[in-house]
Interface confidence: low
C-alpha cells in the first residue's frame, strides 16, 4: 500500500495517476467549461461536492507539517466522485458510448483512492447527496456539473502530488 500505517504516500505513483485523472476528466467532457450550466436548483447540486479549501492543509507548508490532513481530504473527494460516477446519474439514460472515458475515469478514481487508503485504517467518507433526476436531460445536466467540479478537484490534487513528488519523496 502507498500509505502503510499513515506514513507518506508513494508520491510519484500518486502524481502519475492524478495526471492521468486530469487527462481523463477533460476528455470525458472537454467543453464542459464553455457550457452554460446555470439552472434552477444549481446550488443544491454543486454545493455538496468536495472542494479542497485553504484550511485543508494542501498548501506547501501544510503538506510539509502533516500531509495526512490534505491526503484525507483528497481521499474523501476521490471516493465521493467514484460513487457518483458509478451511480444512476452516469449509468442511466442517456447511455454512454462504449469508448467514453467515464469508465476509465471511474476506475482511476478508485485506483488513486486505494493508493491513499492506509493499511487497516478507514477514513470517513462523505455522504453522496441524494440526486435522482427523472428526466434524461436532467441527468445529462448533472453529469456536466459533476464532471466540471471533478475537473477542478483533480487539478488541485494533481498539483498537490506534483509538489509532494518534487519535495517530499524520500
Amino acid at each position: 500500500r502507498a500509505v502503510p500505517g499513515g506514513s507518506s504516500p508513494a508520491w510519484t505513483q500518486c502524481q502519475q495517476l492524478s495526471q492521468k485523472l486530469c487527462t481523463l476528466a477533460w476528455s470525458a467532457h472537454p467543453l464542459v467549461g464553455h457550457m452554460d450550466l446555470r439552472e434552477e436548483g444549481d446550488e443544491e447540486t454543486t454545493n455538496d461536492v468536495p472542494h479542497i479549501q485553504c484550511g485543508d492543509g494542501c498548501d506547501p507548508q501544510g503538506l510539509r507539517d502533516n500531509s495526512q490532513f490534505c491526503l484525507q481530504r483528497i481521499h474523501q473527494g476521490l471516493i465521493f466522485y467514484e460513487k457518483l460516477l458509478g451511480s444512476d446519474i452516469f449509468t442511466g439514460e442517456p447511455s454512454l458510448l462504449p469508448d467514453s472515458p467515464v469508465g476509465q475515469l471511474h476506475a482511476s478514481l478508485l485506483g488513486l483512492s486505494q493508493l491513499l487508503q492506509p493499511e487497516g485504517h478507514h477514513w470517513e467518507t462523505q455522504q453522496i447527496p441524494s440526486l435522482s433526476p427523472s428526466q434524461p436531460w436532467q441527468r445529462l445536466l448533472l453529469r456536466f456539473k459533476i464532471l466540471r467540479s471533478l475537473q477542478a478537484f483533480v487539478a488541485v490534487a494533481a498539483r498537490v502530488f506534483a509538489h509532494g513528488a518534487a519535495t517530499l519523496s524520500p
Epitope: 470525458a28 467532457h29 472537454p30 467543453l31 464542459v32 464553455h34 457550457m35 452554460d36 450550466l37 442517456p94 447511455s95 454512454l96 458510448l97 469508448d99 467514453s100 428526466q135 434524461p136 436531460w137 445529462l140 445536466l141 453529469r143 456536466f144 464532471l147
Partner: nanobody
Framework: EVQLVESGGGLAQAGGSLRLSCAPS????????MGWFRQVPGKEREFVGV????????YYADSVKGRFTISRDSAKNTVYLQMDSLKPEDTAVYYC???????????????????WGQGTQVTVSS
Amino acid sequence: EVQLVESGGGLAQAGGSLRLSCAPSGRAFSGSAMGWFRQVPGKEREFVGVIIWTGGYTYYADSVKGRFTISRDSAKNTVYLQMDSLKPEDTAVYYCAARTPNSSWFPTTLYEYDYWGQGTQVTVSS
C-alpha cells in the same frame, strides 16, 4: 453556413440492417448535439435519437431503443445511425439535425435544432 449531408439510405429486408451517415460540411462543425429524426408522408417529423458531440452521450426514442445505435467519429466529423432488426414501420425519410452549442439542454424536439439535412429514404420490406 453548415450543410448536413446524409447517406446510406436504401432498401432493407425486415430484420436486416442499414447504417446512415451524417457529415457536416461548409465549415468546421462545433455543435453540441446531432440528432436523427424520421418522417412518413402526412405525419410530423419524429425524434429517433441524439448524440451529444462532446462526451458522446446518447438518447433514443422508445420505438427504436435497443435496435438503433448512434455513434460519432470525431476524426471524420461524422455521426452514424446504425439500424438493426429493422421493421416495416421503420420505413421513412431519415433526417440528420445539428444543434449549435448554446445550451446543455437535451434536444429531442424539432424546434431545438438549427441545421437540417435533406433527408435519405429508408424502405423496409416485409
